[in-house]
């Protein structure tokens, strides 16, 4: 049970925070699934990628995404070294040169082809909301998270502590 203030303490200054380095500190491949074990899949359609949330057939291979972890500079009133650590942001890339982007105007999550340096819309603050589950908060819009709506990924505003652990913003990462 974590209050929203615990989240806001770090994310209020996200608009001003900058990535420490242009290179990620860590990268690895993982598949992404929802709290209810539906898989996040990516399909090339009409020269653009679509994102789906669906049940996979037995033995069907899960799509993998490259998770890249970047250290963020804390605002000046936050300690950024040693035992206090630096906030981590991630980018998610299911295929070369394509990254998940937050479209805040449309409240949607899209795959965009782009070159580095990546735009802020491609960065998400990582949260451990629930045991074995993570959540992705928009760097460009604190309090807004990637979530599941009508079998698609969407941006969902989290405006109270009760909603912090709502199932539709919880995701599982799996390397198998």
């Amino acid at each position: 049970a974590f209050g929203i203030s615990g989240v806001q303490k770090y994310t209020r200054a996200l608009h001003d925070s900058s990535i420490t380095g242009i290179s990620p500190i860590t990268e690895y491949l993982a598949s992404l699934s929802t709290y209810n074990d539906q898989s996040i899949t990516f399909a090339l359609e009409d020269e653009s990628y679509e994102i789906y949330v669906e049940d996979l057939k037995k033995d069907e291979k899960k799509d993998k995404v490259l998770l890249s972890y970047y250290e963020s500079q804390h605002p000046s009133n936050e300690s950024g070294d040693g035992v206090d650590g630096k906030m981590l942001m991630v980018t998610l890339s299911p295929t070369k040169d394509f990254w998940l982007h937050a479209n805040n105007k449309e409240h949607s999550v899209e795959l965009h082809k782009c070159e580095k340096p990546l735009p802020d819309q491609a960065f998400f603050v990582l949260h451990n909301m629930h045991s074995n589950c993570v959540s992705f908060e928009c760097k460009t819009d604190p309090g807004v998270f990637i979530g599941v709506k009508d079998n698609h990924l969407a941006l969902i505003k989290v405006d109270s502590s009760e909603n912090l652990c709502t199932e539709n913003i919880l995701f599982k990462l799996s390397e198998t």
Partner: nanobody, 121 residues
Framework: QVQLVESGGGLVQPGESLRLSCAAS????????MGWHRQAPGKQRELVAV???????NYADSVKGRFTISRDDTKNTVYLAMNSLKPEDTAVYYC???????????????WGQGTQVTVSS
Amino acid sequence: QVQLVESGGGLVQPGESLRLSCAASGSIRTVNYMGWHRQAPGKQRELVAVVTSGGGTNYADSVKGRFTISRDDTKNTVYLAMNSLKPEDTAVYYCNAAASTYSSTVVRSFWGQGTQVTVSS
């Protein structure tokens, strides 16, 4: 809030082995990954190996087949077994962990102070 303490570094001859350990302590709620980076004099810090909470691993090309990363979740400890060491492996080896604490859900990056590994004849 989170402390990482490395051990196991030292001076070895080429072809020999070392095993590094890194223990995490403090108000740890969830660990997402633990890994090792290294920094040689005059060079940038680089990723050596990482192991995730699900057991997935990733290695730098230069150490594949020689180094093995493993993790003991019960002790929040990560190990790096380094075999067939080469002079170019000489560096300070830093432990890195991504974790959240009991005071916040935000995942943060924590670093140890580093342990020196020197490979020389």
